[in-house]
């Protein structure tokens, strides 16, 4: 017998064709011989089956000898053998209805697990293969699990259910709730204004939550809460802000903070957490601040950086348009008795300048 696969909630059309290309009498029955529908002349008649309100046919096709059974809003329990009786013949069609759902919300926090559950009719032995938006394939039976969801897992998951050499495809939209960047680093000269941005990697119509930025200054022994805030839709409202530094926060998404000036005592690492309503767990973004200061004290020209720098970063002092006088993988460099002119302090990574501060050395008479 013919096998047709259907998807829960969808509509399926089971075909039944007579040899005569004209409207003749037909009946559709289920495996219990209960009449589903048929015709009486040009009228559609329905039987006492549980499909009554969801079953239909296409009268426009009857004259061509086609008598389809249309079942709307398919349910798993609609899986059955359906029999079309026409011209003293019986055509059997086995309908198997499958459902695939994410057993939790389809909006999941980065790092959480996604479980897809297959609903299938008794006696079936389907296999499932799912392809993630980043092209990763996972296979399984009744359940498929993906642990440690990543940002790239956001999007449409395409799952193929295979049964009796037939296949049916499901598409499930998954939204991974995360910040666009897990970590960022800001390089500033002392006194410059600092901007921290925390763009979200998703858009949700209604977004409610609360957040906090904790800061561990390099010079401090413990971390400190710099700001707490609430989020409602795109509206951001500050609840509490530390007096030093006096941060300012944008009143709408994307989350954005401004530090009036970069100072050595602020250099360090921060962790912005965002707890979303009706979600367990929090979103995190790390932010780092590196501050540079160039000073001249008597006969000593010094350049220093504070904050989380990697060991491969190079700190240099050079007179403008000349070779570096001093260059070290350290957080402070100096030149004694510097000659007059415009000196540059450079923080660089593999030749790329990350931060630069200029200081003018006047001639000594």
């Amino acid at each position: 017998k013919k096998v047709v696969l259907g998807k829960k909630g969808d509509t399926v059309e089971l075909t039944c064709t007579a040899s005569q290309k004209k409207s003749i009498q037909f009946h559709w029955k289920n495996s219990n011989q209960i009449k589903i529908l048929g015709n009486q002349g040009s009228f559609l008649t329905k039987g006492p089956s549980k499909l009554n309100d969801r079953a239909d046919s296409r009268r426009s096709l009857w004259d061509q000898g086609n008598f389809p059974l249309i079942i709307k809003n398919l349910k798993i329990e609609d899986s059955d053998t359906y029999i079309c009786e026409v011209e003293d013949q019986k055509e059997e069609v086995q309908l198997l209805v499958f459902g695939l759902t994410a057993n939790s919300d389809t909006h999941l926090l980065q790092g959480q697990s996604l479980t897809l559950t297959l609903e299938s009719p008794p006696g079936s032995s389907p296999s499932v293969q799912c392809r993630s938006p980043r092209g990763k394939n996972i296979q399984g039976g009744k359940t498929l699990s993906v642990s440690q969801l990543e940002l790239q897992d956001s999007g449409t998951w395409t799952c193929t259910v295979l049964q009796n050499q037939k296949k049916v495809e499901f598409k499930i939209d998954i939204v991974v709730l995360a910040f666009q960047k897990a970590s960022s680093i800001v390089y500033k000269k002392e006194g410059e204004q600092v901007e921290f941005s925390f763009p979200l990697a998703f858009t949700v119509e209604k977004l409610t939550g609360s957040g906090e930025l904790w800061w561990q200054a390099e010079r401090a022994s413990s971390s400190k809460s710099w700001i707490t805030f609430d989020l409602k839709n795109k509206e951001v409202s500050v609840k509490r802000v530390t007096q030093d530094p006096k941060l300012q926060m944008g009143k709408k998404l994307p989350l954005h903070l401004t530090l009036p000036q970069a100072l050595p005592q602020y250099a360090g690492s921060g962790n912005l957490t965002l707890a979303l309503e009706a979600k367990t767990g929090k979103l995190h973004q790390e932010v780092n601040l590196v501050v540079m200061r160039a000073t001249q004290l008597q006969k000593n020209l010094t350049c220093e950086v504070w904050g989380p720098t990697s060991p491969k970063l190079m700190l240099s002092l050079k007179l403008e348009n000349k070779e570096a006088k001093v260059s070290k993988r350290e957080k402070a460099v100096w030149v004694l008795n510097p000659e007059a002119g415009m000196w540059q302090c450079l923080l660089s990574d593999s030749g790329q300048v990350l931060l630069e501060s200029n200081i003018k050395v006047l001639p000594t008479w």
Epitope: Q193, E195, K232, K234, E235, S237, K251, K252, H256, T258
Partner: antibody, heavy 118, light 107 residues
């Protein structure tokens, strides 16, 4: 059509009080931030106060803190500004304004005049 | 509070002229800046949001640009109905602050 209509302005003595109202129509009032902006004679625009429809949070300019209170009655689609301890420098046309979905003041009323004078 | 400095405070121009008004914020405000037009005795009219997004119904001769601290409103070819006072507004954070205004007068 979105409409805002201010009322309640008038002449008041220094130290006195006044309550301004702004009747809104043509949009879902409770969904939006509403604000008051004033303009002294011959001067520029001066933001006074805002209130969120979603959270009820209120924000005031330093010059009016402790003297003016913004409030709203979502069931009546009305915004209020309770002004007390009025000073000469509060003399202005007071405009009611509605924020759009991106939190910019997009629709303004015609204004109501408040004169503080002895 | 964030200060908004608008310049010039007034300018004289002729119909067909290209007019540029600048606005500077005392600190970075992303692109959270709006522009408004006001005619005598009338309420302000919203022209531009997010520094450069023209509101529906606003003629395309108006344009805005900028990010961070420096912003510009340009009228490419001044029309008689454009003679008015223009204000910038920082909408980054509370308190909201306006520039002091630029009056565009007929030369």
């Amino acid at each position: 059509e979105v409409q805002l209509l201010e009322s309640g302005g008038g002449l008041v003595q220094p130290g006195g009080s006044l309550r301004l109202s702004c009747s809104a129509s043509g949009f879902t009032f409770s969904d939006y931030v509403m604000s008051w902006v004033r303009q002294a004679p011959g001067k520029g625009l001066d933001w006074v106060s805002s209130i969120s429809g979603l959270t009820g949070n209120t924000y005031h300019a330093d010059s009016v803190k402790g003297r003016f209170t913004i409030s709203r009655d979502n069931s009546k689609n009305t915004l209020y500004l309770q002004m007390s301890s009025l000073r000469d420098e509060d003399t202005a046309v007071y405009y009611c304004a509605k924020d759009n979905e991106d939190y910019y003041m997009d629709v303004w009323g015609k204004g109501t005049t408040v004169t503080v004078s002895s | 509070a964030i200060q908004m400095t608008q310049s010039p405070s007034s300018l004289s121009a002729s119909v067909g002229d290209r007019v540029t008004i600048t606005c500077r914020a005392s600190q970075g405000i992303r692109n959270d800046l709006g522009w408004y037009q006001q005619k005598p005795g009338k309420a302000p009219k919203f022209l531009i949001s997010a520094a450069s997004s023209l509101q529906s119904g606003v003629p395309s001769r108006f344009s805005g640009s900028g990010y961070g601290t420096d912003f510009t409103l340009t009228i490419s070819s001044l029309q008689p109905e454009d003679f008015a006072t223009y204000y910038c507004l920082q909408d980054y954070t509370y308190p909201r602050t306006f520039g002091q205004g630029t009056k565009v007068e007929i030369k």
